[in-house]
Interface confidence: low
């Protein structure tokens, strides 16, 4: 039976059969190539996910700007890393310097992604409304050569901005753009070009689905570890590996290693070989004490005996991934080269207080 004759791909996705030799037990018998603007194994997801400005998945170091406004005797810096949608506080947005005649703010997504839209918001300073009334969007694959999004007349498209300091305005692009760098250029502003924003889009390959830790589809017995910490040495108060599920709640809601050292690990058995494209980590709290993994390495295997550490493609050595800063935030790291594996191990390198992990693996 030709599996593609019933086209399992949604939204116009192209179904292609995969030969038995290539397939092994890594892939299903077909793959969907999605049209621009759609993602997921079956192109079922409309590509309008927030890319991480508001929730912090986009780090401060990924946000840059042409200039910064400094106010209030030099104490207030309206820096680009503040330009996150719905950010609160007295100084809570980006504003360029008043003498910047070509202001811009840029996000480096660290990898190529589909970008399908932008959500903008103004802010207030000394009770006055400040916001972008109009702006242009440029994008780039390398951070040097930028293309502007064009309108039907082949002119740089001018997007409609905001009308007050707090209202959120969504602009979706007519055609998704493939980009690593996205720049917003304010062209008309009220009082000052003050901005909070979010980018919308999705992963390029669509293979970044949660693999089942958070939703419990990976059973407890498939999550193991080098050791587990017991509060007061009591089994009743164990921080078991099976607790290492993203956003798990309760008094004992994470895996905590039983000893201190770089030989500790947490292992997930995915049940069968899968394409793993990323990981989301989270710390935890132990009776008020904040604990998290500050950095880690990743190892993978198909037999649980022979392990390979994920390599940094640029250096050829084991990649150390940046981890968490606190006990609750999500830190998402995507692999430049996907892993094909059944078993995945997290190898903590640095930590705060104890080695504590909640996580989700991403892939398909």
């Amino acid at each position: 039976l030709d599996i593609c004759s019933k086209n399992p791909c949604h939204n116009g996705g192209l179904c292609e059969e995969i030969s038995q030799e290539v397939r092994g037990d890594v892939f299903p018998s077909y793959t969907c190539t999605c049209l621009k603007g759609y993602a997921g194994n079956h192109c079922e997801t409309k590509c309008v996910e927030p890319l991480g400005l508001e929730n912090g998945n986009i780090a401060n170091s990924q946000i840059a700007a042409s200039s910064v406004r400094v106010t209030f005797l030099g104490l207030q810096h309206w820096v680009p890393e503040l330009a996150r949608l719905n950010r609160a506080g007295m100084v809570n947005a980006w504003t360029p310097s008043s003498n910047d005649d070509n202001p811009w703010i840029q996000v480096n997504l660290l990898r190529r992604m589909w970008v399908t839209g932008v959500v903008t918001q103004g802010a207030s300073r000394l009770a006055s409304h400040e916001y972008l009334k109009a702006f242009k969007v440029a994008y780039s694959l390398n951070g040097h050569e930028f293309d502007f999004i064009h309108d039907v007349n082949k002119k740089h498209k001018e997007f409609v901005g905001n009308w007050n300091k707090n209202a959120v305005h969504v602009n979706l692009f007519e055609t998704p753009v493939e980009a690593q760098y996205v720049r917003l250029y304010p062209t008309s502003c009220h009082t000052a070009c003050t901005l909070r924003f979010e980018l919308l889009g999705c992963e390029l390959n669509g293979c970044a689905n949660p693999l089942g830790l958070k939703n419990n589809s990976i059973p407890d017995k498939q999550i193991t570890a080098s050791s587990s910490y017991k509060t007061w040495g009591l089994h009743l108060f164990s921080w078991n590996p099976s607790y290492a599920r993203l956003d798990k709640q309760g008094n004992f809601n994470a895996w905590v290693a039983g000893s201190y050292g770089n030989d500790q690990w947490l292992q997930v058995d995915l049940g069968s070989s899968k394409e793993v494209t990323g990981i989301i980590t989270q710390g935890a709290r132990n009776f008020g004490s904040v604990q998290f993994v500050a950095s880690y390495k990743v190892a993978y295997s198909n037999d649980s005996a022979n392990w390979t550490e994920y390599q940094d493609p640029r250096t050829g050595s084991s990649k150390i991934f940046p981890g968490n800063w606190d006990n609750h935030s999500h830190k998402k790291n995507l692999f430049e080269t996907p892993i094909l594996a059944r078993y995945v191990r997290i190898l903590p390198v640095a930590w705060h207080n104890r080695i504590a992990l909640r996580l989700e693996l991403l892939g398909c």
Epitope: S259, N286, G288, V290, A294, S295, I320, A350, N353
Partner: antibody, heavy 125, light 107 residues
Framework: QVTLKESGPTVLKPTQTLTLTCSFS??????????VIWIRQPSGAGLEWLAQ???????RYNPSLKSRLTITKDTSKNQVFLTITPVDTADTATYYC?????????????????WGQGTTVTVSS | DIQMTQTTSSLSASVGDRVTITCRAS??????LNWYQQKPGGAIKLLIY???RLHSGVPSRFSGSGSGTDYSLTISSLEPEDIATYFC?????????FGQGTKLEIK
């Protein structure tokens, strides 16, 4: 024995860049669990944590100063560097570096167990 | 950020006295507390870590206690060389924060 020593310019003007060096001996920053922390103390005031660098080159900054701080290390030379830019008169202080060490894992805790003697920096126009 | 408060900014005591310095955290810090001594010349030393553990080389007349939000440093019998400013510091969560210090003087 463990020693740390801070060095850097004693006087700067506002908007300039301050680069401080912490030279240490008696330990290696490639040792798992260790790190170096920068702390400052304005004259007659309390201590303020600025930044820390772990043995694996992971870094953490005080959020209120993060946009102006950069911490780096040269493990082979036993040195850690802190850059503050641009400086302002409010950055006038004595700057200390200290070793971050890890204690018994069961406590899951670390402290600054050895400190430098401090270097005084004045920012004045 | 967690605020650390040392309500007594200066304290005067006689040689041989038992002296207690207190520190309060704005939230529960689960014993993740250190005490440091700063001599008039500026040198800083670790005395106590994890609320009650004596750092190596520190005289046994120093001790620490407390839990939750309230902690104290005790010198069982004050010596002249103990004249210094004492700081508490929480390590429960980043950013690390310090108390404003308690200056100890001899009567």
């Amino acid at each position: 024995q463990v020693t740390l020593k801070e060095s850097g310019p004693t006087v700067l003007k506002p908007t300039q860049t301050l680069t401080l060096t912490c030279s240490f001996s008696g330990f290696s920053l490639s040792t798992s669990g260790l790190g170096v922390i920068w702390i400052r103390q304005p004259s007659g005031a309390g201590l303020e944590w600025l930044a820390q660098i772990y043995w694996d080159d992971n870094k953490r900054y005080n959020p209120s100063l993060k946009s102006r701080l950069t911490i780096t290390k040269d493990t082979s030379k036993n040195q850690v560097f802190l850059t503050i830019t641009p400086v302002d008169t409010a950055d006038t202080a004595t700057y200390y570096c200290a070793r971050r060490t890890f204690y018994d894992y069961d406590e899951g805790f670390y402290a600054m167990d050895y400190w430098g003697q401090g270097t005084t920096v004045t920012v004045s126009s | 950020d967690i605020q650390m408060t040392q309500t007594t900014s200066s304290l005067s005591a006689s040689v041989g006295d038992r002296v207690t310095i207190t520190c309060r955290a704005s939230q529960d810090i689960s014993n993740y507390l250190n005490w440091y001594q700063q001599k008039p010349g500026g040198a800083i030393k670790l005395l106590i870590y994890y609320a009650s553990r004596l750092h190596s080389g520190v005289p046994s007349r120093f001790s620490g206690s407390g839990s939750g939000t309230d902690y104290s440093l005790t010198i069982s019998s004050l010596e002249p060389e103990d004249i210094a400013t004492y700081f508490c510091q929480q390590g429960n969560t980043l950013p690390l924060t310090f108390g404003q210090g308690t200056k100890l003087e001899i009567k």
